[in-house]
């Protein structure tokens, strides 16, 4: 009684069970009842990364540099070529076709996380006690400046986009 | 016999142009990745371009990038890197080498001499 | 960039001794789809191209004596030569052929006493 189900690395066709071709390897001819599947492997620029009876590869992704791309990791026979940004940019989406500038964080907020290849900068509001009046892909949030160390009192207060301004103490007059 | 045979080398001046060939044989050039790699004098190896089989992707070294093109002609088995702006740190011998995942083949290599 | 460090620069051994020679990667080489390590291992005799070793880290050549062995996983690999021969005076090159730019070590040049 031919079978209706196979095992793990093959397939059903013709009422016959066939072995899958291995992932780097396309699909040539179906067994038969007096012949082995017959695979062939994937050309220099495709690939397959299952267990398959697919009778085409997949080409390898193309890391445009034109676009800001460039190569994290090479194609191989049996894995896709991966891509990644170029210093100063970062992907687009999960799959990476195209690049853009990293986001800066305006004056009042700082850099939480600094960008990478694949993610943008994460800004944080800056909190009480803490400015950037600056526009910064790279900079935190700094803290203001204590004037109390300095032996010096505060003239003006600071905010989430300056820095406070010091002075020195009121003589007492005698 | 699977050869690589690369040609078009010589002496050009700094700012000037050349472009050398690698002549394949003995194998199904379609089905091959190629590259070039050079060797500056008594120095080690530096790959500075590949080509997929079917032309649809190239990549540079960014030390030749915007001056010297890879390209291939597959009707006539043969491998073309195209050299501008040649600079005398270009001065190497250069080779061809076939790859599928790694460089199997190489050629013999051809002389550039860029100076005045 | 993948940067490549060989160890040592040189060395002069005897025939008959088993050399071993280091080649570090700035990065790991390990391709987490398919579990292969991409560096390769070439053999450059004076006045000669470079000739294929050893690929994958450890799968030699078709033709490669098997005298030569290459070993290693994510950024660190050796080449070794079981007992070496006149004939191998050469300099030994590692390859990054995980990414582009692919990137070359500088070399080990071996030399027979």
């Known amino acids: 009684e031919p079978p209706t189900a196979c095992r793990e690395k093959q397939y059903l066709i013709n009422s016959q069970c066939c072995s899958l071709c291995q992932p780097g390897q396309k699909l040539v001819s179906d067994c038969t009842e007096f012949t082995e599947t017959e695979c062939l492997p994937c050309s220099e620029s495709e690939f397959l990364d299952t267990w398959n009876r697919e009778t085409r590869c997949h080409q390898h992704k193309y890391c445009d540099p034109n676009l800001g791309l460039q190569v994290q990791q090479k194609g191989t026979s049996e894995t896709d070529t991966i891509c990644t940004c170029e210093e100063g940019l970062h992907c687009t989406s999960e799959s990476c076709e195209s690049c853009v500038p990293h986001r800066s964080c305006l004056p009042g907020f700082g850099v939480k996380q600094i960008a990478t290849g694949v993610s943008d900068t994460i800004c944080e509001p800056c909190p009480v006690g803490f400015f950037s009046n600056v526009s910064s892909a790279f900079e935190k949030c700094r803290p203001w400046t204590s004037c109390e160390t300095k032996d010096l009192v505060v003239q003006q207060a600071g905010t989430n986009k300056t820095d406070v301004v010091c002075g020195p103490q009121d003589r007492q007059r005698a | 016999e699977v050869q690589l045979v690369e040609s078009g080398g010589g002496l050009v001046k700094p700012g000037g142009s050349l472009k050398v060939s690698c002549a394949a044989s003995?194998?199904?050039?379609?089905?091959?990745?190629m590259n070039w790699v050079r060797q500056a004098p008594e120095k080690g190896l530096e790959w500075i371009a590949y080509?997929?089989?079917?032309?649809?992707?190239?990549y540079y070294a960014d030390t030749v990038k915007g001056r010297f093109t890879i390209s291939r002609d597959n009707a006539k088995n043969t491998l073309f890197l195209q050299m501008t702006s040649l600079r005398s740190e270009d001065t190497a011998m250069y080779y061809c080498?076939?790859?599928?995942?790694?460089?199997?083949?190489w050629g013999t290599g051809t002389t550039v001499t860029v100076s005045s | 960039d993948i940067v490549m460090t060989q160890s040592p620069s040189s060395l002069t051994v005897t025939a008959g001794e088993m050399v071993t020679m280091s080649c570090k990667s700035s990065q790991s080489l390990l391709n987490s789809g398919n579990q292969k390590n991409y560096l390769t291992w070439f053999q450059q005799k004076p006045g000669q191209p470079p000739k294929l070793l050893i690929y994958w880290a450890s799968t030699r050549e078709s033709g490669v004596p098997d005298r030569f062995a290459g070993s290693g996983s994510g950024t660190d690999f050796t080449l070794t030569i079981s007992s070496v021969q006149a004939e191998d005076l050469a300099v030994y090159y590692c390859?990054?052929?995980?990414?582009?730019?692919?990137?070359f070590g500088a070399g080990t040049k071996l030399e027979i006493k």
């Open positions: 080498a076939r790859s599928w995942g790694y460089f199997d083949v």
């Open positions: 003995g194998f199904t050039f379609s089905d091959y990745g």
């Open positions: 390859q990054n052929d995980y990414t582009y730019p692919l990137t």
């Open positions: 080509i997929s089989s079917g032309r649809s992707n190239i």
